[in-house]
Amino acid sequence: RSFFSFLGEAFDGARDMWRAYSDMREANYIGSDKYFHARGNYDAAKRGPGGAWAAEVITDARENIQRFFGHGAEDSLADQAANEWGRSGKDPNHFRPAGLPEKY
């Protein structure tokens, strides 16, 4: 696999992550955080190694920023578990809250 295909996957993966975070903010649905974290990582990792790498880099950066702003350790662990769940190819719908609109 070429470096360029890795970069392409990383770019697409970053876009998947952005879309998931953007949907999460738009939905503003209680209990949906883990679903969106898992979905973003799942979609990105499906792109290939570059996508999985981008997902990891983005989630790590996000965690560090949130930790800096005092995001709770318990929430952080739950988010990390959901990130890893999606990245490992497990179904993000496992975390889907009842009634979340189908567009998400």
Partner: antibody, heavy 121, light 107 residues
């Protein structure tokens, strides 16, 4: 203690609709989703869908979209399921079951007593 | 949709015997499986969730095991009240689906 009380048996004509209810008590109603399950001789147990009691929004099994509509009344801690355009295939026992959280994926520790719906001309 | 297949469909046993019911998922559901018992004319009752966690108030003669696609429910030293139907259910993705059922009868 947690209790789910369902409405009584219904005998209905083909083509009409029926609305059955399930009242939750002994817990904080909006903390747990409420699911509906169909039991018929032909298909054993089938998951129909679930209503998020916090928001009042429902998620359905694709198979029951257009057939079942779930609603709730927070003030009385009651959920409702309306079944439309009934046919003999809809004759079954319908159970409400409390979810383990507000997520779709759940096991069911608490069940209503069931509502028998019979569709007959 | 994930298909859940139980075997056997029916089973005859005597009080005091040990029986095992199996449930196969059409795809990997990890450990997200529940087991229920249902007696004639009654609602199902939760026995096990997460494949092996015993629900509150369930006697220790019941035990669940398995992961991935193969699961089993074992009942040690059958009691008269254990006869009835048993169902598995996955709680992994959507839609939730139940097994085909196993009827446990007194021999």
């Amino acid at each position: 203690q947690v209790q789910l009380q369902q409405s009584g048996a219904e005998l209905v004509r083909p083509g009409v609709s029926v609305k059955i209810s399930c009242k939750g008590s002994g817990y904080t109603f909006t903390d747990y989703a409420m699911h509906w399950v169909k039991q018929s001789h032909a298909k054993s147990l089938e998951w129909i869908g679930v209503i998020n009691t916090y928001y009042g929004d429902a998620s359905y099994n694709q198979k029951f979209k257009g057939k079942a509509t779930m609603t709730e009344d927070k003030s009385s801690s009651t959920v409702y399921m309306e079944l439309a355009r009934l046919t003999s295939e809809d004759s079954a026992i319908y159970y409400c079951a409390r979810g383990s959280s507000l997520m779709i994926t759940s096991w069911f520790a608490y069940w209503g007593q069931g509502t028998l719906v019979t569709v007959s001309a | 949709d994930i298909q859940m297949t139980q075997s056997p469909a029916s089973l005859s046993a005597s009080v005091g015997e040990t029986v095992t019911i199996t449930c196969r998922a059409s795809e990997n559901i990890y450990s997200y499986l529940a087991w229920y018992q249902q007696k004639q004319g009654k609602s199902p009752q939760l026995l096990v969730y997460n494949a092996k966690t015993l629900a509150e108030g369930v006697p220790s003669r019941f035990s669940g095991s398995g992961s991935g696609t193969q699961f089993s429910l074992k009942i040690n030293s059958l009691q008269p009240e254990d006869f009835g139907s048993y169902y598995c259910q996955h709680h992994y993705g959507t839609p939730l689906t139940f097994g085909t059922g196993t009827k446990l009868e007194l021999k």
